[in-house]
Interface confidence: medium
């Protein structure tokens, strides 16, 4: 299939509230009108789909209501935010971009962003 370059940061540290954001940028070879973005998680050689959204160029990304992902698009950049992360979710998060329409179909897969999640220390009990 037609390959497309996708760039994303190598490492991101999630916030104490379990939120991680990163930019996924693709080098669009053509004038796509509809783009599909998928976030994959790779851990222990297992790859699972975290979330996916299809959007029209110039419009907002729409993830499913129960998705842990949100995002915005600007040109050939997608700003992705993953919420509700815990330490066990640490892993490599790969951005996959597909230019769906019009033909030809293009596929690009980033090298992945290593997201580190550290669970916050529980607050000590207080006598006050």
């Amino acid at each position: 299939c037609k390959a497309m370059h996708v760039a994303q940061p190598a490492v991101v540290l999630a916030s104490s509230r379990g939120i991680a954001s990163f930019v996924c940028e693709y080098a669009s070879p053509g004038k796509a009108t509809e783009v599909r973005v998928t976030v994959l998680r790779q851990a222990d050689s297992q790859v699972t789909e975290v979330c996916a959204a299809t959007y029209m160029m110039g419009n907002e990304l729409t993830f499913l209501d129960d998705s842990i992902c949100t995002g915005t698009s600007s040109g050939n950049q997608v700003n992705l935010t993953i919420q509700g992360l815990r330490a066990m979710d640490t892993g490599l998060y790969i951005c996959k971009v597909e230019l769906m329409y019009p033909p030809p179909y293009y596929l690009g897969i980033g090298n992945g962003t290593q997201i580190y999640v550290i669970d916050p220390e529980p607050c000590p009990d207080s006598d006050f």
């Epitope: 299939c1 509809e34 597909e98 329409y101 019009p102 033909p103 030809p104 179909y105």
Partner: antibody, heavy 118, light 108 residues
């Protein structure tokens, strides 16, 4: 295996309208881009129109642009082709077909004959 | 628009013979995005080959595709009685999607 059942063909006068339907079995209908392809009597195949799986993107051949409208209702697993201002040269057998990601046609309906004649 | 020209228009052969069908594009078909279809009278087309050389599910291995750029070939190694039909090529490397005019393979 998805199956495509077409309805809505017939004889119509020039300038009039007709709507074709293509009902798909299977729960993955919204995963497929869909197209309409036609074949004039004794002639070859001509791609007419396509629509993305979400229905958000539509494409037309120049020969039908502005006259035909492709749409889909994913809740009903049905594809439509609204044909307005029909001309004699639109007379053909019309096929609905599923598109792979790569835009070849992997599954075809059984055909609907549209005859435009006065 | 990419124009596809198929030749010959008609191929007269006997069962057991080898059939070689040509599809030539007016400009290069990127990534070999070319498909072949078989159509029998009164039936819908059936996908045989995609990506210029990959056989679709359930297609016998006597059908093979080759080529790149502007020249593509469909080969049927040994014609079976059910192979006599019209064959179309289609490019999907650019919009609009276009088909060739077809090659009819008939019994000699």
């Amino acid at each position: 295996q998805v199956q495509l059942v077409q309805t809505g063909g017939g004889v119509v006068q020039p300038g009039r309208s007709l709507r074709l339907s293509c009902a798909a079995s299977g729960s993955t209908f919204s995963s497929y881009a869909m197209s309409w392809v036609r074949q004039a009597p004794g002639k070859g195949l001509e791609w007419v129109s396509a629509i993305s799986g979400s229905g958000g993107s539509t494409y037309y051949a120049d020969s039908v642009k502005g006259r035909f409208t492709i749409s889909r209702d994913n809740s009903k697993n049905t594809l439509y082709l609204q044909m307005n201002s029909l001309r004699a040269e639109d007379t053909a057998v019309y096929y609905c077909a599923t598109n792979s990601l790569y835009w070849y046609f992997d599954l075809w309906g059984r055909a609907t004959l549209v005859t435009v004649s006065s | 628009e990419i124009v596809l020209t198929q030749s010959p228009g008609t191929l007269s052969l006997s069962p057991g013979e080898r059939a070689t069908l040509s599809c030539r594009a007016s400009q290069s078909v990127s990534s070999s995005y070319l498909a072949w279809y078989q159509q029998k009278p009164g039936q819908a087309p059936r996908l045989l080959i995609y990506g210029a050389s990959s056989r679709a599910t359930g297609i016998p291995d006597r059908f093979s595709g080759s080529g790149s750029g502007t020249d593509f070939t469909l080969t049927i190694s040994r014609l079976e009685p059910e192979d006599f039909a019209v064959y179309y090529c289609q490019q999907y490397g650019s919009s609009p999607l276009t088909f060739g005019g077809g090659t009819k393979v008939e019994i000699k």
